[in-house]
């Protein structure tokens, strides 16, 4: 029987116009060297920022071995979408797919790619492309992990105390202060996935003037400063 | 283990055909896509066509077709290539590879067989 | 068609030295982050042995010796450090399409 798990690739694109392209495919190497130790199925996590253009690929399987493409998709809340392609009949289906914004690439018979235009939270989820050939089938799962860019802002609201949020993330930001102070930090869920970090930081020591906010995230890091008056300051705010 | 056996040696006058077995074994036959490829004396490697076992697919190279014919007997796990028309410069050695899944990589090959046309 | 261009034709190497061919085609062999590109070797009087496959992935058995790289339309292979047995043609071949090879490069060992 076939090696099954050869693994589903992510395209890297160029960038599209004013929309940025995600480069998710695998790196060649690491994928033939997972096909060549016959693992079994490994789920692969893979982030993507939101509002991208994601391309995802199937393994390195020529039209002429195969018999039937299929990518299974599944995600949060919603019935698991298929989209096949069968040779034989030059056919494909559909079943339960209702995202307009992920389609194949091409016709299939050309290219098994699947894309996502502007990637939005609710393509959080599990991609599967098998490829059904005489010998078995190949296939690699995927979780596609969605990443929300958070705001971050920085101000203080009574004698020598300092807030920092992060605002609307995915996942959570981590916040650390420079110097450390004496701080408190709550994490908000919302309901669409994304989560709010706010780090309240005290600073008894009177000669710390300058206190840092130090934000970090899968999408990138960002630092504030603020200098520490006797009254409430100014409002600093900024995106990664 | 894998195993591609070709038939032997021919030598064909021109304007003859000449068919070249090729038989498999070490996996199911039908499932794996077979190439044939020549070798005229002192050159290299130039692909014929392809067939697929298992649906009975043929691709051949636009230089061979009208001449060359390949075809299968899953019976006997056996491929054959039949080219016709024989000329001078079909002499060559003429091998079967078996194309794996993955990348398209043809990881196992006949021993050759050597076609000789000569009047 | 796609074309493949090998370069050099021949090539005289000492043991321990490297060899690098080059193998040029007449358009992209890449797609979906894949490069369609193999490498065989020939010895005479044998079939050929697949090398390298998709570029840069070396066959199970072949010597660390060997590598492959780049994408698109253009590729490498490299022997180093070359040994006497290494005498042999080289061939790409490509499976983007219908399968093609190119002309060959003859590697012999001073």
């Known amino acids: 029987a076939a090696q099954p798990n050869n693994s589903l690739m992510l395209q890297t694109s160029k960038e599209n116009h004013a929309l940025a392209s995600s480069s998710l495919c695998m790196d060649e190497k690491q994928i033939t060297q997972n096909y060549s130790k016959v693992l079994a199925e490994v789920n692969t996590s893979w982030p993507v920022k939101m509002a991208t253009n994601a391309v995802l690929c199937c393994p390195p399987i020529a039209l002429r071995n195969l018999i039937i493409i299929t990518w299974e998709i599944i995600l949060r809340g919603q019935p698991s979408c298929t989209k096949a392609y069968k040779k034989e009949t030059n056919e494909t289906k559909e079943t339960n797919c209702t995202d307009e914004r992920i389609t194949w690439v091409s016709r299939p018979d050309q290219n098994s790619d699947l894309q996502i235009r502007t990637v939005a939270i609710t393509h959080d989820g599990y991609y599967r492309c098998i490829m059904v050939t005489p010998d078995g089938n190949f296939h690699r799962g995927y979780h596609l992990q969605v990443l929300v860019t958070p705001e971050v802002t920085l101000f203080q609201n009574r004698n020598r105390t300092a807030v920092c949020k992060a605002v609307a993330g995915k996942p959570a930001a981590h916040i650390s202060w420079i110097p450390e102070g004496d701080c408190a930090t709550k994490q908000e869920y919302w309901s669409n996935g994304t989560v709010t970090v706010k780090s309240t930081c005290h600073w008894e020591v009177h000669n710390v003037s300058t206190v840092t906010c130090h934000v970090s995230h899968l999408t990138g890091n960002k630092s504030l400063y603020i200098e520490l008056l006797p009254v409430p300051g100014a409002k600093k705010s900024a995106k990664l | 283990q894998v195993q591609l056996v070709q038939s032997g040696a021919e030598v064909k006058k021109p304007g003859a055909s000449v068919k070249v077995s090729c038989k498999a074994s070490g996996y199911t036959f039908t499932s794996y896509v077979m190439h044939w490829v020549r070798q005229a004396p002192g050159q290299g490697l130039e692909w014929m066509g392809y067939?697929?076992?298992?649906?009975?697919?043929?691709n051949y190279n636009e230089k061979f077709k009208g001449r060359v014919t390949m075809t299968r007997d899953t019976s006997t796990s056996t491929v054959y290539m039949e080219l016709s028309s024989l000329r001078s410069e079909d002499t060559a050695v003429y091998y079967c590879?078996?194309?794996?899944?993955?990348?398209?990589?043809?990881?196992?090959w006949g021993q050759g067989t050597l076609v000789t046309v000569s009047s | 068609d796609i074309v493949l261009t090998q370069s050099p034709a021949s090539l005289a190497v000492s043991p321990g030295q490297r060899a690098t061919i080059t193998c040029r085609a007449s358009k992209s062999v890449s797609t979906s982050g894949y490069s369609y590109m193999h490498w065989y070797q020939q010895k005479p009087g044998q079939p050929p042995k697949l090398l390298i496959y998709?570029?840069?992935n070396l066959e199970s058995g072949v010597p660390a010796r060997f590598s492959g790289s780049g994408s698109g339309t253009d590729f490498t292979l490299t022997i180093n450090p070359v040994e006497a047995n290494d005498t042999a043609n080289y061939y790409c071949q490509h499976s983007r399409e219908l399968d093609t090879f190119g002309q060959g490069t003859k590697v012999e060992i001073k």
């Open positions: 067939i697929n076992p298992y649906n009975d697919d043929t």
């Open positions: 998709l570029a840069s």
């Open positions: 590879a078996r194309e794996d899944y993955y990348g398209s990589r043809w990881g196992y």
